[in-house]
Interface confidence: medium
């Protein structure tokens, strides 16, 4: 089951997601998507990182912490009721079926 997080309309929502890089600066690609984690990748991608930096993001969706140290927590700014739902944080570890997948449920009130 998904871990549940709450936020109020008009406030910022915080969805935590962390991993430990194998070595400083040795990053693993990460994607955030709206909807539960599928078998591969993320559906409805809202933000993505590569081995070096954030390479895709959409309005209101930002990385909240120091992603170069493995904090890939997501901030959704100024949320509305439409932002409710499941979000997928996927740590795309190299190799077959090695990905770490986290489904987080956001409840807006």
């Amino acid at each position: 089951s998904e871990v549940e997080y709450r936020a109020e309309v008009g406030q910022n929502a915080y969805l935590p997601c962390f991993y430990t890089p194998a070595a400083p600066g040795n990053l693993v690609p990460v994607c955030w998507g709206k909807g539960a984690c599928p078998v591969f990748e993320c559906g409805n991608v809202v933000l993505r990182t590569d081995e070096r930096d954030v390479n895709y993001w959409t309005s209101r969706y930002w990385l909240n912490g120091d992603f170069r140290k493995g904090d890939v927590s997501l901030t959704i700014e100024n949320v509305t009721l439409a932002d409710s739902g499941i979000y997928c944080c996927r740590i795309q570890i190299p190799g077959i079926m090695n990905d770490e997948k986290f489904n987080l449920k956001l409840v807006i009130k």
Partner: antibody, heavy 122, light 108 residues
């Protein structure tokens, strides 16, 4: 080419007000967190305030909280700093700086303006 | 709140290697960024995320960060490298950006 141009500095008496502006060009302004950083004559750099790309979230150094207000007009590609109840210790060159992309807090300051001098003196 | 400690000054002969330290409690757990500032000019980013170099910054500039110390290293120092160098981190506990008080690099 990214450009940041500050204006609005000058001489003001203690207790007075000033509004600084920073005109930005060469990038999608609303996609980036922006900050103000100041440097008193011969002193260190001091972060003053920051604002998220949408303008929905703001942050202030303790030394200016309650006196300064940061804002932005994304339709005009302009960042502002409203400074009230100015003190002698606010005398400094004020720089606007652009944060790194895709990050809520900006994390590092990739581009800087040339600065505008604010002098608070009677 | 984290405090960043830099030596006030470092002197080095041309062609040699300069190392500028930035100390802070468990600074290795944070990303450190470095800026160069020449007299009368705005700061310029020279290293970000501990060791990455922006385009246009010579390969002679490098950075490292571990434990309680981050280090900016300038190899084959040139006269034009003479400047103040500042380290910077984002303190997530306070959501404040912190700068060290700068190190003046003098090229002898």
């Amino acid at each position: 080419e990214v450009q940041l141009l500050e204006s609005g500095g000058g001489l003001v008496q203690p207790g007075g007000s000033l509004r600084l502006s920073c005109a930005a060009s060469g990038f999608t302004f609303s996609s980036y967190a922006m900050s103000w950083v100041r440097q008193a004559p011969g002193k260190c750099l001091e972060w003053v305030s920051a604002i998220s790309g949408s303008g929905g979230s703001t942050y202030y150094a303790d030394s200016v909280k309650g006196r300064f207000t940061i804002s932005r007009d994304n339709s005009k590609n302009t960042l502002y700093l409203q400074m009230n109840s100015l003190r002698a210790e606010d005398t400094a060159v004020y720089y606007c700086a652009r944060g790194s992309y895709g990050t809520y807090y900006g994390n590092y300051f990739e581009y800087w303006g040339r600065g505008t001098l604010v002098t608070v003196s009677s | 709140q984290t405090v960043l400690t830099q030596p006030p000054s470092v002197s080095v002969a041309p062609g040699k290697t300069a190392s500028i330290s930035c100390g802070g409690d468990n600074i290795g757990g944070k990303s450190v960024h470095w800026y160069q500032q020449k007299p009368g000019q705005a700061p310029v980013l020279v290293i970000y995320y501990d060791s990455d170099r922006p385009s246009g910054i010579p390969q002679r500039f490098s950075g490292s960060n571990s434990g309680n110390t981050a280090t900016l290293t300038i190899h084959r120092v040139e006269a034009g490298d003479e400047a103040d160098y500042y380290c910077q981190v984002l303190d997530r506990r306070s959501d404040h950006w912190l700068f060290g008080c700068g190190t003046k690099l003098t090229v002898l």
